[in-house]
Interface confidence: low
């Protein structure tokens, strides 16, 4: 059959599975006169033969692991043995079968992990190799934990990345592992080829011994420091320590102080750097962080709490220059005149701020000294001997000594003797009629003026009038302010009026004195007055319980998923209808009746990490008033972006001919959120046929090296496809291409004759 199994001499490629018995011919080449016979040369390895009549065949089983590609040359010879056609390249590709077992590089691995390590963060790797072709399932390895010892209640504390062999803690392991309880674990890990998906796959196992080590990165106990220390500063107050040497420590001050009075050294010792003042700040909270040599945090910061302990460094102080009390002429022995108070800046409810009061002087001393008493700790001032008379003295000046355990302060107290309070306040009108106000009347507005009079001694507590609302204002929407000169009462709005809850109210005022009435005199109906307040409705906008609503969803949330709910209430009780504004990407819709918000399109964190829309609530019916709140949809990252090259790598070149194998370095990145973990990319050539010429080797999680394997390259441009895998959940693989030009160089740059200047590379390697 011409074409498939026979034909003229020309360059050809054949694919043959390894391990197959040599039972059939590969191809029948036809000789064109004067050619009468053929000659086969190159990498025949004694396996490939050609008969005189052009029959190409192999004599032994092929082994891909010995040679994956055989490069042969075939020539047609005349009867004298001279070449009349060719030689042409004949390539035999040996196709892989799964004839090699995966093998772990070690029969036993040992590793250690700190308790509370982050779940999913690798702390060790196991590695296996398989001689089969990694570009086929035969050489694709799948790692698995087969046994965990001990294993309680079937809970796995360890997990393995089935592609990379990275071992990390599960969330349960991160929480439960405790070196005190059990520091030793053993895993049996298996590796299978065929990606672990075939019952005929080969496997190997290895043993992994894991030691759980204590996590010593812990917040220290709260520290107590006495204020105003006179010892030389800095003074060590506590210490933190990272699990391994070499950490760089620093303090984070969240409280904006003019001077931050703490420091940390590189042993993790924390110092107070200056005396502290409890009266300025009674406690400090700051954070200690540990970072690696690149300035990257090794763990979460630790909270350091410092309590400043009080010392008695403040004397008592008088609350005012003179404190004035009033006492009526007729008051009896023991009557309370008032409570005298001073202040101490030291810590409350502490020995340093407990004050004692003592009367040390009375002027005048008529009719006798010691007319007054003061309670030693309470400060209550009482009549100590008998009733006072204005004719003896209308005023007494007392000196009060206030002391704490170390300091004494003198304060002045003036006691005025006033007429007896035997007259009650009397309202000029008992009924102030009615008034109608709208519910949006401004706070502070005076809505009514009331007046009562009192015939007791003017400008004393016996004649001063205090107005109280004793009925009809349970919500405290009104207040009465008294003019001290005229005793006029101004009724003002203190809180917004509300038609919906109190449309009509009967208000009752009472006029009373700060001084007690004498025995036998009582307030009567003359001291009370009434007033009716009617509130009219103002249509109010719907009210949201908060101005910003927030929901967190994964960016791969299905279209139509409910992502949140926003509600508003109309003060008049009207139905509210909801709509969205500024829905600029059209990602959301809202149920106009319930306020439920749904996704209407694929969400993408890389486009918008927080999607913000306005929600409008509008009254249905009425005057269609509306109000607005914000809905913030926080999109959580999903590994949905393949890796890519971090920058533009056009213009890469090698000078031709290569004098030695060369290499170049490139960097990968991807658009997924990298805050949780640094990228851990793996790199591979994108075509198997490139492996004889090129090699990609990983430098770290983001960088790799592309190297030439020999120096025999043509003077041309090579496009090298490279696969970059991010190892995420799910893993994403990006295919990128590096264009490398092999060119003649002048002064280390590519040389092109004039007129052929298109796309000259600019970077030499």
């Amino acid at each position: 059959q011409e074409g498939k199994f026979s034909g003229p001499l020309k360059p050809m490629t054949f694919s043959i599975f390894e391990g197959q018995e040599p039972s059939q011919i590969i191809f029948q080449f036809k000789a064109n006169p004067p050619a009468v016979t053929f000659e086969l040369t190159g990498e025949t390895d004694g396996i490939f033969k050609i008969e005189k009549d052009g029959l190409l065949y192999h004599t032994r089983v092929l082994d891909r692991e010995t040679r994956a590609v055989h490069h042969l040359q075939l020539a047609a010879l005349d009867s004298q043995g001279a070449i009349v056609d060719g030689p042409v390249p004949i390539i035999i590709e040996v196709k892989d079968i799964n004839d090699n077992r995966p093998t772990f590089l070690q029969t036993k691995y040992e590793g250690s992990v700190r308790q509370n390590s982050r779940p999913g963060k690798p702390f060790m790797y196991v590695n296996a190799t398989d001689l089969d072709d990694p570009a086929t399932p035969n050489g694709q390895l799948f790692y698995q934990i087969v046994i965990q010892l001990p294993k309680i209640n079937n809970v796995m504390y360890f997990q393995i990345d089935n592609k990379t062999g990275a071992i990390s803690l599960t969330p349960e392991g991160s929480q439960v592992l405790d070196p005190i309880k059990n520091p030793y674990y053993n895993l049996v890990v298996s590796v299978k080829d065929m990606g672990g998906q075939n019952e005929n796959s080969f496997s190997d196992t290895t043993s992994v011994d894991i030691t759980v080590r204590e996590n010593i990165w812990k917040a220290p106990e709260p520290v107590e420091i006495r204020e105003n220390l006179t010892d030389p500063h800095p003074i060590k107050i506590t210490q933190v320590q990272w699990n391994d040497p070499g950490a760089h420590y620093s303090l984070i001050n969240k409280e904006k102080l003019p001077q931050f009075p703490f420091s940390i050294d590189q042993e993790g010792n924390i110092y107070v750097t200056q005396p502290l003042d409890r009266e300025e700040k009674d406690s400090h909270v700051f954070f200690a962080t540990a970072k690696d040599e690149n300035g990257k945090p090794l763990a979460y910061p630790l909270e350091i709490r410092v309590k400043v302990i009080d010392i008695n460094d403040n004397p008592p102080t008088c609350l005012s220059q003179v404190t004035v009390f009033e006492v009526q002429e007729n008051e009896v022995l023991g009557s309370s005149i008032g409570i005298f108070a001073a202040h101490d800046m030291d810590e409350a409810n502490n020995i340093n701020s407990i004050l004692k009061y003592r009367l040390v002087d009375q002027t005048p001393k008529v009719p006798s000294d010691e007319l007054f008493l003061i309670d030693e700790y309470g400060g209550k001032v009482q009549l100590g001997k008998r009733s006072l008379k204005k004719q003896d003295s209308p005023q007494y000046n007392l000196t009060v000594e206030v002391s704490d355990i170390d300091f004494k302060t003198l304060c002045s107290l003036q006691v005025n003797v006033i007429d007896i309070n035997d007259q009650i306040p009397i309202f000029e009108r008992s009924d102030y009629g009615s008034k109608t106000l709208s519910e949006d009347t401004a706070i502070g507005s005076t809505i009514l003026i009331i007046q009562a009079t009192d015939d007791d001694e003017p400008f004393t507590g016996s004649s001063k009038i205090l107005y109280k609302i004793v009925q009809g204002d349970t919500e405290g929407r009104l207040e009465v302010v008294t003019d001290p000169m005229t005793n006029t009462g101004y009724v003002k709005i203190r809180k917004p009026l509300d038609f919906e809850t109190e449309p009509v109210t009967s208000i009752v005022f009472k006029a009373e004195n700060p001084e007690p009435l004498v025995n036998g005199i009582e307030y009567n109906a003359s001291s009370f007055a009434s007033f009716e307040l009617t509130v009219t409705d103002v249509n109010e906008v719907p009210v949201f319980p908060q101005q910003i609503f927030q929901a967190n969803v994964s960016e791969d949330t299905a279209i139509g998923t409910k992502v949140g709910t926003v509600t508003a209430r109309d003060p008049e009780g009207l139905t509210v209808s909801y709509s969205l504004k500024d829905n600029k990407r059209g990602w959301l819709k809202i149920d106009s009746v319930t306020g439920d918000i749904f996704s209407t399109a694929p969400l993408d964190r890389e486009t918008e990490s927080v999607y913000r829309v306005q929600v409008v609530a509008t009254e249905v019916g009425g005057s269609s008033l509306s109000s607005t709140a914000y809905f913030h949809l926080v999109l959580m990252d999903v590994n949905d972006n393949p890796p890519r090259l971090a920058k533009d790598y056009t213009g890469l070149f090698f000078c031709h001919p290569l004098s030695a194998p060369g290499s170049l370095i490139f960097e990968a990145t991807d658009d997924d959120q990298q805050s949780v973990r640094r990228p851990k990319f793996t790199f591979a050539l994108g075509r198997e046929s490139l492996q004889s010429d090129w090699e990609v080797s990983k430098i770290n999680g983001t960088h790799a090296r592309l190297s030439t394997k020999h120096t025999r390259f043509e003077e041309q441009v090579y496009d090298i496809p490279i696969l970059i895998n991010d190892g995420g959940q799910p893993p994403m693989e990006g295919i990128v291409s590096l264009s490398v030009t092999f060119c003649q160089c002048v002064d280390g740059s590519c040389f092109r004759p004039a007129g052929n200047q298109v796309g000259i590379p600019t970077v030499g390697m």
Partner: antibody, heavy 120, light 105 residues
Framework: QVQLVQSGAEVKKPGASVKVSCKAS????????MNWVRQAPGQGLEWMGV????????GYAQKFQGRVTMTVDKSTSTAYMELSSLRSEDTAVYYC?????????????WGQGTTVTVSS | DIQLTQSPSSLSASVGDRVTITCRAT?????IHWYQQKPGKAPKPLIY???KLASGVPSRFSGSGSGTDYTLTISSLQPEDFATYYC????????FGQGTKLEIK
């Protein structure tokens, strides 16, 4: 079978302290965490803290830090919870609850509860 | 700390009804547990790690959910199921939902 038996009801004045005991039997006391959970009248459950009898390791809920002390007596397989500076809102039923072996956040066995009343 | 909100707070149902109680967390959780409490008694574990039945719990109880939203379902109510149900989040420090009281209609 696993049993947790708690001490009897207590009536305390505001400012006082109360110490509730929880005697464990039917399992190895030091192998399991002991949690304390309280329930005010007509209210829900509130986790107070945990102690690991093997090592004496403790973890308290922020709300009770400074007022609660959890201890164990390994010789009698008894856990204790002491709450100081009592106030009326501490009136509640206090439960001890065993944390399941490998994972102390699942409470598999509970005591019968101890009623503590704080009243002046 | 993570807060849990159960809904409804109370519900009336009849024997044979299918009942669903939900528990919503303020941030994403790996696991949640459910407890049943009868008046004057200590709570009992019902479902742990979202959907696993505690020992001795009938199969009419089931649990599901992920992330922040979890559900307890009783497929056919029995007289002994009238009680208060609590969800509890597994992250330290542990918190409970406010409870759902299931009463006879």
């Amino acid at each position: 079978q696993v049993q947790l038996v708690q001490s009897g009801a207590e009536v305390k004045k505001p400012g006082a302290s109360v110490k509730v005991s929880c005697k464990a039997s039917g399992y190895t006391f030091t192998d399991y965490y002991m949690n304390w959970v309280r329930q005010a009248p007509g209210q829900g459950l509130e986790w107070m803290g945990v102690i690991y009898p093997y090592s004496g390791g403790i973890g308290y809920a922020q709300k009770f830090q400074g007022r609660v002390t959890m201890t164990v007596d390994k010789s009698t397989s008894t856990a204790y919870m002491e709450l100081s500076s009592l106030r009326s809102e501490d009136t509640a039923v206090y439960y001890c609850a065993r944390g399941r072996g490998d994972y102390f956040g699942l409470f598999d066995f509970w005591g019968q509860g101890t009623t503590v009343t704080v009243s002046s | 700390d993570i807060q849990l909100t159960q809904s409804p707070s109370s519900l009336s149902a009849s024997v044979g009804d299918r009942v669903t109680i939900t528990c919503r967390a303020t941030s994403s959780l790996s696991y949640i547990h459910w407890y049943q409490q009868k008046p004057g008694k200590a709570p009992k574990p019902l479902i742990y790690e979202i959907s696993k039945l505690a020992s001795g719990v009938p199969s009419r109880f089931s649990g599901s959910g992920s992330g922040t939203d979890y559900t307890l379902t009783i497929s056919s109510l029995q007289p002994e199921d009238f009680a208060t149900y609590y969800c509890q989040q597994w992250n330290y420090p542990f918190t409970f939902g406010q409870g759902t009281k299931l009463e006879i209609k």
